[in-house]
Amino acid sequence: GPGLSMFAGQAAQPDPCSDENGHPRRCIPDFVNAAFGKDVRVSSTCGRPPARYCVVSERGEERLRSCHLCNASDPKKAHPPAFLTDLNNPHNLTCWQSENYLQFPHNVTLTLSLGKKFEVTYVSLQFCSPRPESMAIYKSMDYGRTWVPFQFYSTQCRKMYNRPHRAPITKQNEQEAVCTDSHTDMRPLSGGLIAFSTLDGRPSAHDFDNSPVLQDWVTATDIRVAFSRLHTFGDENEDDSELARDSYFYAVSDLQVGGRCKCNGHAARCVRDRDDSLVCDCRHNTAGPECDRCKPFHYDRPWQRATAREANECVACNCNLHARRCRFNMELYKLSGRKSGGVCLNCRHNTAGRHCHYCKEGYYRDMGKPITHRKACKACDCHPVGAAGKTCNQTTGQCPCKDGVTGITCNRCAKGYQQSRSPIAPCIKIPVAPPTTAASSVEEPEDCDSYCKASKGKLKINMKKYCKKDYAVQIHILKADKAGDWWKFTVNIISVYKQGTSRIRRGDQSLWIRSRDIACKCPKIKPLKKYLLLGNAEDSPDQSGIVADKSSLVIQWRDTWARRLRKFQQREKKGKCKKA
């Protein structure tokens, strides 16, 4: 027959926190007796000093007492609290026992710390003595700082605990402790049981997954049992009462707290951490001692307890590998149709947006790389002079160019434009060579020679010429535009050496020259060059700027002239022009 694989018995255990397809599913730690082997703090234990106690038994109508010694120093005669949570062997019962006759209003308490939050299903006590006449069970959810009642037992609920007897449990009060007289009989005199089931009779127990109230109700970090009143035969006040009183005490052979380590459906076991604290071994991207929050960077949807239908695992934020931190925003989650609420923090690699899903200002997407690539965003590198801004098109990378500028980064002049030296208008239109003849104007002469003498550009500058003109300025031609019978030059006035009645200011201005003057090169002027302009005051077409004509002197600028012109300026101030 077929041979058995040597590893057959070692098949990997199925993962309780995910299904066969690897999808997350609810998982819960094993059901345990959370009290087993744990220390119980008790308010009273017999045997210190050694004391007599008597065990009552009944034979028909006859009551028998057998007396023994409780001695805390003798292991054979001691009844320590450790016996509450040791292995419960019915054939060899070990019992914790209190001091004798601690009767109401004195009480005896047993306090058990579970070490972490548990979801408690039951609390049970098996007695070696008769069961108490009145007893309360309390729970703490904050490691013993505060206590809330879990259950009361008494034949006199109102008198002992100010609670109604067997009050009905409704949806409205299912997280409240009730008082009952069940389990309060004196008999059996030994071996009696009190078992409190936390969900018994609670209306939402059938839908526990969807009842936060009951989930909270069964949660405890500590359990306390308070024995309030002993059952007696009523003989404790008779003449020979000492024997009777030595017969009344509380003795318990077994304390059990049945439940599961609380992990909210996100862990299959609890383990000891480095501090030896009990914690859930969290799965589904959860964290915390009870898997009660999402682990860092898994904040795309709110933390939720797992249910039988939904694992409600925590989901990583989608930051396209550009952020290490994110936070949850409930309103964004709702606005997304309850799909995604994570907001990425400190997007790196020049990305931006809630998911670091687009490029930040000054960068654009390199479509050849996925958005997750660390170089998915490239710098726009818009030309500092040619571009109108630093932000480029997110997909094409095209920078916004100034007039006459082209190129993806706005780094060159467009066709029909030439470079200027102005940072404001770095590219200016190349002036269309004006026609030598123009039939459009009657005034315009047939022959330029009879109209004016075209300047040869080698003119000299002297005091006489300076004095004859109304203004003298150094200009930089930036741009030329045809405007009807005029050419309008945008010029930058660099220095003013003389001005007439109309004040000429430095900076960008308009210079107007008639078309016919330009046609006959009177004056001869080219964009992007610097000139010394000497002219007479005349009204310009737009009432602003300056006018030059055939009588104006336009000479290509030489830096050596600056000093000479300053001298002319000083002489003019001293009245030398009138003499010239």
């Epitope: 309103e331 964004l332 606005l335 149709g337």
Partner: antibody, heavy 109, light 101 residues
């Protein structure tokens, strides 16, 4: 204290674009979503959309998708509603409202 | 979209009366419901959020309850100044929707 101050034209012509501004003060602008809600005369309230000023993410009521844009200017602590192709049926009071646990703060409309 | 249906559409009551308004959601909205009051010519005012939490400064006579699909808004003892239009609103899932008032 928290204030939401609205500004914009009282009237726009049909087919024109409505532009309303909501200027905030009294809290950290980027920490709360800003919503726009409108109310036709004598009618109920209608949620239009919202923006998260922290990063400019928006969410719109499908009814207005394509016509509605909500934007922010963090430097001015302002949120702007722009709605194109206005029609007489869009006649309403437009409110900006701060999100969070319910709309605790509203503009004057 | 989630519909929020308010009832009654209008009601008259006297000072001191206990007044209840209900709001029914077309699907479960957990407890993501708010209640507002609006007086003529004024912006709405938040009274209750998360179905039952009274907003800061709101008088204790106003209360809210419910979860899932059925919600109730109560004024325990009506005062003259309470005359207004009341709206419920869900913010469970986009688009946010209001009751008709």
């Amino acid at each position: 204290q928290v204030q939401l101050q609205q500004s914009g034209p009282g009237l726009v012509k049909p087919s024109q674009t409505l532009s309303l501004t909501c200027a905030i003060s009294g809290y950290t602008f980027t920490s709360y979503n800003m919503h726009w809600v409108r109310q036709a005369t004598g009618q109920g309230l209608e949620w239009m959309g919202a923006i998260y000023p922290g990063n400019g993410d928006t969410s719109y009521n499908q009814k207005f998708k394509g016509r509605l844009t909500i934007s922010k200017d963090t430097s001015k602590n302002q949120v702007v509603l722009t709605m194109t192709n206005m029609d007489p049926v869009d006649t309403a009071t437009y409110y900006c409202a701060r999100g969070g646990t319910g709309f605790a703060y509203w503009g004057q409309g | 979209d989630i519909q929020m249906t308010q009832s009654p559409s209008s009601l008259s009551a006297s000072v001191g009366d206990r007044v209840t308004i209900t709001c029914k959601a077309s699907q479960s909205v957990s407890n993501d419901v708010a209640w507002y009051l609006q007086k003529p010519g004024q912006s709405p005012q938040l009274l209750i959020y998360y179905a039952s939490n009274r907003y800061t400064g709101v008088p204790s006579r106003f209360s809210g309850s419910g979860s899932g699909t059925d919600f109730t808004f109560t004024i325990s003892s009506l005062e003259a100044e309470d005359a207004a239009t009341y709206y419920c609103q869900q913010d469970y899932s986009s688009p946010w929707t209001f009751g008709q008032g």
